[in-house]
């Protein structure tokens, strides 16, 4: 190939360094922060994305704390340990030797402890509830149109198989998207619901991880759907283990 074509880019991950040095001059990309090779035909794992984000730190976000067993990402950003496949390691520790266990989306699911803390397995997050509130519109969106557009979005943009979008609920102005994916359902090559939800979250915030994107342009029958707040709840296959002290705080 010519010198003019000696650049390549990763459509699914801005936070990469790429060069066409793969077989047959195919584009090969590595994630910032970890240096791990990423597959640009699909989504990059949330763990590698967080690691890349921490290599170019920005202001940490603050998230709302819900009740019950559903987890949200209260701890904000951290520099995670990822396994060779790019998944979160079950135990995460910070630089002051404070450790905790996380689920497959990297959200803390135990109290914090010290280096003696054991996390026997990476517990899978099998149900994600994305709770959105849209800005006021002249009228409510048609539910079936909204459902179809969101399912299209998750299939085409986030590469998530339609069977993992369990439901789209709508009571103006609240939209809820339910993603479900058990360990037994996830085949090789399937996008993880946690990764799809993370890409969606970043898109909604105007921090798109895709090349050439600032944020998400979402329309239902030509009418812009503008999200004014987002909450994401994570449900694990095994309930989290927090002390009563935290639960009553």
């Amino acid at each position: 190939h010519t010198a003019a074509q000696d650049n390549c880019t990763c459509p699914t991950n801005k936070m990469t360094v790429c060069s066409p040095d793969g077989p047959g001059g195919r584009c090969q990309c590595r994630a910032l922060g970890s240096g791990m090779a990423v597959d640009c035909s699909t989504l990059t794992s949330k763990c590698l994305l967080l690691k890349a984000r921490m290599s170019a730190p920005k202001n940490a976000r603050t998230l709302v704390r819900p009740s019950e067993h559903a987890l949200v990402d209260n701890d904000g950003l951290y520099d995670p340990d990822c396994d060779p496949e790019g998944r979160f390691k079950a135990r995460q520790c910070n630089q002051t030797s404070v450790c905790w266990c996380v689920n497959s989306v990297g959200v803390r699911r135990t109290d914090k402890g010290d280096l003696s803390l054991r996390c026997d397995e990476l517990v899978r997050t099998h149900h994600i509830l994305i709770d959105l509130r849209h800005r006021p519109t002249a009228g409510a969106f048609n539910h079936s149109d909204l459902d179809a557009e969101l399912r299209r979005l998750f299939r085409e943009r986030y590469r998530l198989h339609p069977k993992f979008v369990a439901a789209v609920h709508y009571e103006q102005p609240t939209i809820q998207i339910e993603l479900r994916q058990n360990t037994s359902q996830k085949a090789a090559g399937d996008v993880d619901i946690g990764d799809a939800a993370y890409y969606f979250e970043r898109d909604i915030k105007g921090e798109s991880l895709f090349q050439g994107r600032g944020g998400l342009d979402l329309r239902v029958r030509g009418e812009p759907l503008q999200v004014e707040r987002t909450l994401i709840y994570y449900l694990d296959e095994i309930p989290p283990k927090f002390s009563m002290k935290r639960l009553t705080a």
Partner: nanobody, 126 residues
């Protein structure tokens, strides 16, 4: 930034053929979903065809099905639109676009495509 360049347009008689090519100057099109669109005078831009990045699946508008073929030429780093049995109603400016989508379909909105070319004129006339 991807800068897309279309080539291959021109004047052709009804029933004739043309092959349009889409290339990205300075970049490969690996992993990008590529769509072809056209805009006839006084009409809105419409989707013609696309090829998905995830599995290479293709979509064609009903008006071109069986006559147009979209393909990737990895050696030349292009995405081509082979247009056969051209009709006067195929006259339009043809654009290619690249999107960070995994899949494309009839219902993929044009705003899902991130980068657009300047277009190449196709005129079908006797």
């Amino acid at each position: 930034q991807l800068q897309l360049v279309e080539s291959g347009g021109g004047l052709v008689q009804p029933g004739g053929s043309l092959k349009l090519s889409c290339a990205a100057s300075g970049f490969t099109l690996d992993y990008w979903t590529i769509g072809w669109f056209r805009q006839a005078p006084g009409k809105e831009r419409e989707g013609v065809s696309c090829i998905s990045s995830s599995d290479g699946s293709t979509y064609y508008a009903d008006s071109v099905k069986g006559r147009f073929t979209i393909s990737r030429d990895n050696a030349k780093r292009t995405v081509n639109l082979q247009m056969n049995s051209l009709k006067p109603e195929d006259t339009a400016v043809y654009y290619c676009a690249a999107g960070s989508l995994g899949y494309c379909s009839r219902s993929t909105p044009q705003y899902e495509y991130d980068f657009w070319g300047q277009g190449t004129q196709v005129t079908v006339s006797s």
